[in-house]
């Protein structure tokens, strides 16, 4: 049993450690950037390729605030949603809705999270509580994974991959509320 994902009142999916969120069906965040990434070498022929590295999928960047109970992160975090079908890198369209998706006739390739990073966020809470900290696990990159009929959905989570190292450097020190802490300035999370 890992850290669970839960929904807050705004129905935002908040991934906690150890559980990987499914990409939302639709993103309406105006800060979302659509980029085709993870391109590999183009295949000799679209129907002959067998190497997963020859496929590519989209990484959608979006920002959101992390919430925990009544608390919210001082700053938004940026993470990726792995989106769309996988196809040969050279045939991937550059924008959603343009071009025609290439679909392999044999095995299915899915765009799934590849690496994760944990980020420490400073939480601001109502009612005068001192800021406190939480770590959220965020998708750092996406990859194409070849699925055969023997694969099931649970294997898409790819639990074996190692999280990318979060950014280094001293971060502010969260303190629970105390006489001293009440006077402390709220510091940035990162």
């Amino acid at each position: 049993q890992g850290w669970q994902a839960f929904k807050n009142d705004a129905t935002e999916i908040i991934p906690e450690l150890g559980e990987y969120p499914e990409p939302p069906p639709e993103l309406e965040n105006n800060k979302t950037m659509n980029r085709a990434e993870n391109g590999g070498r183009p295949p000799h022929h679209p129907f002959e390729t067998k190497d997963v590295s020859e496929y590519s999928c989209r990484e959608l960047h979006f920002t959101r605030y992390v919430t925990d109970g009544p608390c919210r992160s001082a700053k938004p975090v940026t993470e990726l949603v792995c989106s769309g079908q996988c196809g040969p890198a050279r045939l991937l369209p550059n924008a959603i809705g343009r071009g025609k998706w290439w679909r392999p006739s044999g095995p299915d390739f899915r765009c799934i999270p590849d690496r994760y990073r944990a980020q420490r966020v400073q939480l601001l809470c109502p009612g005068g509580e001192a800021p406190r900290a939480r770590k959220v696990r965020l998708v750092a990159s996406c990859k194409c994974k070849r699925l055969t009929r023997f694969h099931n959905q649970s294997e898409l989570k790819d639990f074996g991959t190692e999280a990318a190292r979060p950014q280094k450097g001293r971060k502010p020190r969260p303190r629970a509320r105390s006489a001293k802490a009440n006077q402390a300035e709220l510091e940035n999370a990162y």
Partner: antibody, heavy 118, light 107 residues
Framework: QVQLVQSGAEVKKPGASVKVSCKVS????????QHWVRQAPGKGLEWMGW????????EYASKFQGRVTMTEDTSTDTAYMELSSLRSEDTAVYYC???????????WGQGTTVTVSS | DIQMTQSPSSLSASVGDRVTITCRAS??????LAWYQQKPGKAPKLLIY???TRWSGVPSRFSGSGSGTDFTLTISSLQPEDFATYYC?????????FGGGTKVEIK
């Protein structure tokens, strides 16, 4: 599967130090906050402190300040708690716990019994 | 330090009973309250956090409520595996402190 496996029981003399280890598996230790909680025989739970293995940040209960040191080895995903100047009142089961916040304890180790006796 | 007072310190109940345990904080802790279950010789397990949010995998018969200084853990229909000691814990102010525990025994 999240697991925390602690080192074995220890018997120490008053004035000595003890170092308890806690091996974390199921996720990288640097992605968490590590907590230590103790429980004297037949008594309740007592929080000792937390640390952030990623940056070495720590917060200790004032009762243990100056006597406790919490460290981690991120290469082996192991947390350590060292308590010095032991007295008989330090006889307890020491638990490591981990979580994604500084204020709750999501997963716990099995506990390490430390007996302080002359 | 914030004192957490649990009552009762022990209770006897039968399988199927509705059990209520209360926890009172010596000062306002908002909703920074967690509940843990501990069985003899075992480590505690997180049941409830944020006063009322069930932890992953915890059965729905466990529920928490309250804010400020008064909190309640309710087991709607006691099961054989629920006989244990229950602790509340405040996460509002350092040092974090636990209640003295409530032992739920078989009647």
């Amino acid at each position: 599967q999240v697991q925390l496996v602690q080192s074995g029981a220890e018997v120490k003399k008053p004035g000595a130090s003890v170092k308890v280890s806690c091996k974390v598996s199921g996720f990288p230790i640097k992605d968490t906050f590590q907590h230590w909680v103790r429980q004297a025989p037949g008594k309740g739970l007592e929080w000792m402190g937390w640390s952030d293995p990623e940056i070495g940040d720590t917060e200790y209960a004032s009762k243990f300040q100056g006597r406790v040191t919490m460290t981690e080895d991120t290469s082996t995903d192991t947390a350590y708690m060292e308590l010095s100047s032991l007295r008989s009142e330090d006889t307890a089961v020491y638990y490591c716990a981990t979580g994604d916040t500084t204020y709750k304890f999501d997963f716990w180790g099995q506990g390490t019994t430390v007996t302080v006796s002359s | 330090d914030i004192q957490m007072t649990q009552s009762p310190s022990s209770l006897s109940a039968s399988v199927g009973d509705r059990v209520t345990i209360t926890c009172r904080a010596s000062q306002d802790i908002h909703t920074y309250l967690a509940w843990y279950q501990q069985k003899p010789g075992k480590a505690p397990k997180l049941l409830i956090y944020w006063a009322s949010t069930r932890w992953s995998g915890v059965p729905s018969r466990f529920s928490g409520s309250g804010s400020g200084t008064d909190f309640t853990l309710t087991i709607s229909s006691l099961q054989p595996e629920d006989f244990a000691t229950y602790y509340c814990q405040q996460g509002d102010t350092l040092p974090y402190t636990f209640g003295g525990g409530t032992k739920v025994e078989i009647k």
